[in-house]
Interface confidence: low
């Protein structure tokens, strides 16, 4: 056996776990399920930005943000099919080591540029619905774009070490050419702190945040509906916010978990090839659940507001836009017709979606 | 551990065939599988390999003439020799290779004692 000088429990795990991962179900379910996504993604995303930035022409906080998480999950959709071949072939990457480098870190830069953009959209819905009147100033189309900015700024931060540490290369004898993260057994520290970072800073930290928010908000809208006991009740809204914080816990957490079981594998806590099969047969299949799901977010977001889905439903009929910009309404993004924090005078009415994009 | 043993090597005229095959003590089904070749005073070469599925690849010295095949069931990888010329005059090596699709890519891989294929012209 080459390389097997280290005693460390990481290189262990290579040595006696030769199946992990390699099954023959693997190498066409997955560039299968990575076309869908695609296919999917390419089309649903490429229309959220049209309606957003043409249709809707880009007047809300929301949809600034939205527009980002399109536009995000547009860059990653890109490289899939990259990645597709890459499964198909076994994984041997036949694209050079620029590809390498830009679709790994492209997939990094999506995780983590769609959780923040996704977290400050829960804190701008919250300030929203909560604080209408204290956060309006606050919740200007400018603080929405340099926020959206510093997001792009600290995702791209976060996939530098995919730029700089994933790379192409030909491993000896065989004819096999990889792009991953190459590294000494002994320097460990590298993947660790990448799959503890993605699971602390790229999900536990948003999702609680998350959590946070739509409790928030989910507090606020029953104290106004218990204000408001004669009118009735309605109910869409809390399935909405019920739907927004499970649809981002359960999309994400499988592939958190087994990332989290990976990094145990790497620290040789976990020494079981069973388990080692299962994380690595397992880690194809979360990415897909994870970013499908996550290409899916502009339209679930989207379609809960009633001129997004006009808009998409119109563009679908090739109805092109107004030359007209639409009139600018001064509440903008946070409009509702019932706003718990307002005074209880304005409560008459019954309280309206409170996720429209604009 | 895997061990593998060559056999159906020998002397050929040129232009014949041959057909060599590597037995393993154990499962292959999770291996990639290759054949090298070492002429003598020049370095080991590969020669053709098949992956977990069916992907194969060859050296562009022995493309078309060469077919490798695997025999998950037997545990057996076959190389199918045709035309064969001379310059395969080496001994032909199988071994079985393998390493993580994740971030740690640890190389390594199990060699057999090798079968000497001898082609005269």
């Known amino acids: 056996i080459l390389n097997s000088s280290t005693e460390d429990g990481i290189k262990r795990i290579q040595d006696d776990c030769p199946k992990a991962g390699r099954h023959n179900y693997i190498f066409v379910m997955i560039p299968t399920l990575y076309s869908i996504i695609f296919v999917v993604g390419i089309f649903g995303n490429s229309l959220v930005v049209i309606v957003i930035y043409f249709y809707m022409k880009l007047k809300t906080v929301a949809s600034v943000f939205l527009l980002n998480l399109a536009l995000a999950d547009l860059c990653f959709l890109l490289t899939l099919p990259l990645w597709a071949v890459y499964t198909a072939m076994e994984y041997r990457w036949p694209f050079g080591n620029y590809l390498c480098k830009i679709a790994s870190a492209s997939v990094s830069f999506n995780l983590y540029a769609s959780v923040f953009l996704l977290t400050c959209l829960s804190i701008d819905r919250y300030l929203a619905i909560v604080h209408p009147m204290k956060s309006r100033l606050r919740r200007t189309m400018l603080v929405a774009k340099v926020t959206c900015i510093i997001i792009w700024l600290l995702a791209g931060l976060a996939s530098l070490p995919a730029i700089i540490h994933r790379n192409v290369f030909f491993i000896e004898n065989t004819n096999i050419t990889v792009c991953a993260f190459h590294y000494e057994s002994q320097n460990s520290t590298l993947p660790i702190g990448l799959g503890l970072t993605k699971n602390i800073l790229g999900f536990l930290f948003p999702f609680l945040i998350i959590l946070t928010s739509y409790t928030l908000i989910w507090k606020a809208l029953k104290k106004a509906y218990e204000i408001q006991k004669n009118k009735p009740r309605n109910d869409d809204i809390f399935k909405i916010i019920m739907a927004i914080v499970l649809f981002f816990f359960f999309s994400w957490i499988p592939h958190q978990i087994f990332t989290f079981l990976d990094v145990l594998i790497q620290l040789g806590i976990i020494r079981d090839c069973r388990i080692a099969d299962i994380v690595d047969t397992a880690m194809p299949i979360t990415i897909c659940i994870a970013y499908f799901n996550n290409c899916l977010n502009p339209l679930f977001y989207g379609f809960l507001g009633k001129k997004f889905k006009r808009y998409f439903l119109q563009l679908l009929k090739y109805i092109p836009p107004k030359a007209k910009s639409h009139s600018n309404l001064s509440t903008k993004m946070s409009t509702l017709s019932y706003r718990p924090s307002d005074n209880v005078s304005s409560s008459t009415k019954k309280p309206a979606p409170c996720f429209e994009v604009e | 551990q895997v061990q593998l043993q060559e056999s159906g090597g020998g002397l050929v005229q040129a232009g014949g065939s041959l057909r060599l095959s590597c037995a393993a003590s154990?499962?292959?089904?999770?291996?990639?599988m290759g054949w090298y070749r070492q002429a003598p005073g020049k370095e080991r070469e590969f020669v053709a390999g098949?992956?977990?599925?069916?992907?194969?690849n060859y050296a562009d010295s022995v493309k078309g003439r060469f077919t490798i095949s695997r025999d998950n069931a037997k545990n057996t990888v076959y190389l199918q020799m045709n035309s064969l010329k001379p310059e395969d005059t080496a001994v032909y090596y199988c071994?079985?290779?393998?390493?993580?699709?994740?971030?740690?890519?640890?190389?390594?891989?199990?060699w057999g004692q090798g079968t000497q294929v001898t082609v005269s012209s």
């Open positions: 071994a079985a290779y393998n390493y993580f699709p994740r971030s740690i890519v640890y190389y390594y891989v199990y």
């Open positions: 098949i992956g977990v599925g069916t992907t194969t």
């Open positions: 154990g499962s292959i089904s999770y291996y990639r």
